[in-house]
C-alpha cells in the first residue's frame, strides 16, 4: 500500500512539476525591468526565452519575437535547449510512469517490468528537473552578469554616442516558477525511484542450481531445503543432499536416474 502511495504521489508531483516547467518555458517574464527615468513615458520591459515585451504606462504593450537565431546570445540558446530537453524527458517519463503505476493493470505485466518502468521514469524525472533548474539558473546568472557589466559605460559608436543605462533587471516570475517546478519534478523522480525498490519482487532465499542425489539409495525429498536450514525434521544431520557443491570432475560423473535439474 505504501509503495502504491509513494508511486502515485511521485507521479502527481512530477506531473505538476512538468506542467510548471512547460509554463515557465512559455512565459515572457524571465527578466523584468522598470525604465521610469524616461521623459516620454514610464516603460516596463520584460523578456522571455522567445520574445521581448514593452509595456507603457498607458497600458499599451508591444512584444517582438527573437526571429533571428544568429544574433541571440549563446547562453539564451543553451537555456532554451535545457528547458526543451527537460520538457521532452519529463513528457516521456510521464508516459512511461502511467503504464508503470501499480493501480493500473495492463494485460499480464509483471511487477518486475513495472519496477523497471518506475525506475526509468524516476530517472527521467530527475534529469528533467535538473535540466529545468540548470536552465533557470543559467538565465539568472546571465542577468546578474549583464547588470555588473553595464555599469554606466559610455562609448562612441558609428552612429554617435552610446550610453549604457544602468537599471537593475530583476528576476521575473518565470524564474521562480522554473525553480519550483524543477524541484518538484526532481522530488517526484526520487519518489518514483524509492517506489521502484518496493515494487521489485523479493529475491528467493535459494539459488536455482542443479541438485544431484548423493547416491542411488537417497532420493530427493521436498523437505530437503527445510532440513538444510535447520527447521526440518532431519535431527540426526543425515546428509540428504550436498547442495550441489561439486568440483568440475564430480559434475561430469555418470548420470543417474535420480539426477534433478
Amino acid at each position: 500500500m505504501a509503495v502504491t502511495a509513494c508511486q502515485g504521489l511521485g507521479f502527481v508531483v512530477s506531473l505538476i512539476g512538468i506542467a510548471g516547467i512547460i509554463a515557465a518555458t512559455c512565459m515572457d517574464q524571465w527578466s523584468t525591468q522598470d525604465l521610469y527615468n524616461n521623459p516620454v513615458t514610464a516603460v516596463f520591459n520584460y523578456q522571455g526565452l522567445w520574445r521581448s515585451c514593452v509595456r507603457e504606462s498607458s497600458g499599451f504593450t508591444e512584444c517582438r519575437g527573437y526571429f533571428t537565431l544568429l544574433g541571440l546570445p549563446a547562453m539564451l540558446q543553451a537555456v532554451r535547449a535545457l528547458m526543451i530537453v527537460g520538457i521532452v524527458l519529463g513528457a516521456i517519463g510521464l508516459l512511461v510512469s502511467i503504464f508503470a503505476l501499480k493501480c493500473i493493470r495492463i494485460g499480464s505485466m509483471e511487477d518486475s517490468a513495472k519496477a523497471n518502468m518506475t525506475l526509468t521514469s524516476g530517472i527521467m524525472f530527475i534529469v528533467s528537473g535538473l535540466c529545468a533548474i540548470a536552465g533557470v539558473s543559467v538565465f539568472a546568472n546571465m542577468l546578474v552578469t549583464n547588470f555588473w557589466m553595464s555599469t554606466a559605460n559610455m562609448y562612441t559608436g558609428m552612429g554617435g554616442m552610446v550610453q549604457t543605462v544602468q537599471t537593475r533587471y530583476t528576476f521575473g516570475a518565470a524564474l521562480f516558477v522554473g525553480w519550483v517546478a524543477g524541484g518538484l519534478t526532481l522530488i517526484g523522480g526520487v519518489m518514483m525511484c524509492i517506489a521502484c525498490r518496493g515494487l521489485a519482487p523479493e529475491e528467493t532465499n535459494y539459488k536455482a542450481v542443479s541438485y544431484h542425489a548423493s547416491g542411488h539409495s537417497v532420493a530427493y525429498k521436498p523437505g530437503g531445503f527445510k532440513a538444510s536450514t535447520g527447521f526440518g525434521s532431519n535431527t540426526k544431520n543425515k546428509k540428504i543432499y550436498d547442495g550441489g557443491a561439486r568440483t568440475e570432475d564430480e559434475v561430469q560423473s555418470y548420470p543417474s536416474k535420480h539426477d534433478y535439474v
Epitope: 524571465w30 527578466s31 525591468q33 525604465l35 524616461n38 516620454v40 513615458t41 516603460v43 520591459n45 523578456q47 521581448s52 515585451c53 514593452v54 507603457e56 504606462s57 498607458s58 499599451f60 504593450t61 508591444e62 517582438r64 527573437y66 533571428t68 544574433g71 546570445p73 547562453m75 539564451l76 538565465f139 546571465m142 542577468l143 549583464n146 547588470f147 557589466m149 553595464s150 559608436g157 552612429g159 554617435g160 554616442m161 552610446v162 550610453q163 549604457t164 543605462v165 537599471t167 533587471y169
Partner: nanobody, 119 residues
C-alpha cells in the same frame, strides 16, 4: 551594435518647414522610446519631442503646437515635422532612442546630430 542615421537638416527661412528623420539599425529587441533633443550654441541640451511605441508623445514647451513627432515601428524610424520655424529653433538636433539591446540590458543611443539653421 545600434546605429542611428539622421537626415533632413538644413537651412530654412523663418516660418518655413523641415522634416527630420532618424532610422535605427543593428541588432536589438525593442525600441520603447524614440525622440529628438536639440542643443543651441552655449545652451544645454533640451527635449524637443519624444514618442513611445504605443504612440504616447511628449513635447518641449517651446515647440508645442508647431512640431509633430511620429514614428514607423516596422522601420524603426522616427520623424519630426517642424512647422512655423523661428530663429530660436536654430540648433543641432540629436536623435535619441532607448533600445532593449539584449537579455537584461538596454542602451540609450544618441545620433551624431543634424544642424538646423533658421535664418
Amino acid at each position: 551594435q545600434v546605429q542611428l542615421q539622421e537626415s533632413g537638416g538644413g537651412l530654412v527661412q523663418p516660418g518655413g518647414s523641415l522634416r527630420l528623420s532618424c532610422a535605427a539599425s543593428g541588432t536589438f529587441f525593442n525600441i520603447p522610446v524614440m525622440g529628438w533633443y536639440r542643443q543651441a550654441p552655449g545652451k544645454q541640451r533640451e527635449l524637443v519631442a519624444g514618442i513611445s511605441t504605443g504612440g504616447t508623445t511628449n513635447y518641449g514647451d517651446s515647440v508645442k503646437g508647431r512640431f509633430t513627432i511620429s514614428r514607423d515601428n516596422a522601420k524603426n524610424t522616427v520623424y519630426l515635422q517642424m512647422n512655423s520655424l523661428k530663429p530660436e529653433d536654430t540648433a543641432v538636433y540629436y536623435c535619441n532612442v532607448l533600445v532593449i539591446s539584449g537579455i537584461g540590458s538596454h542602451l540609450e543611443v544618441w545620433g551624431q546630430g543634424t544642424l538646423v539653421t533658421v535664418s
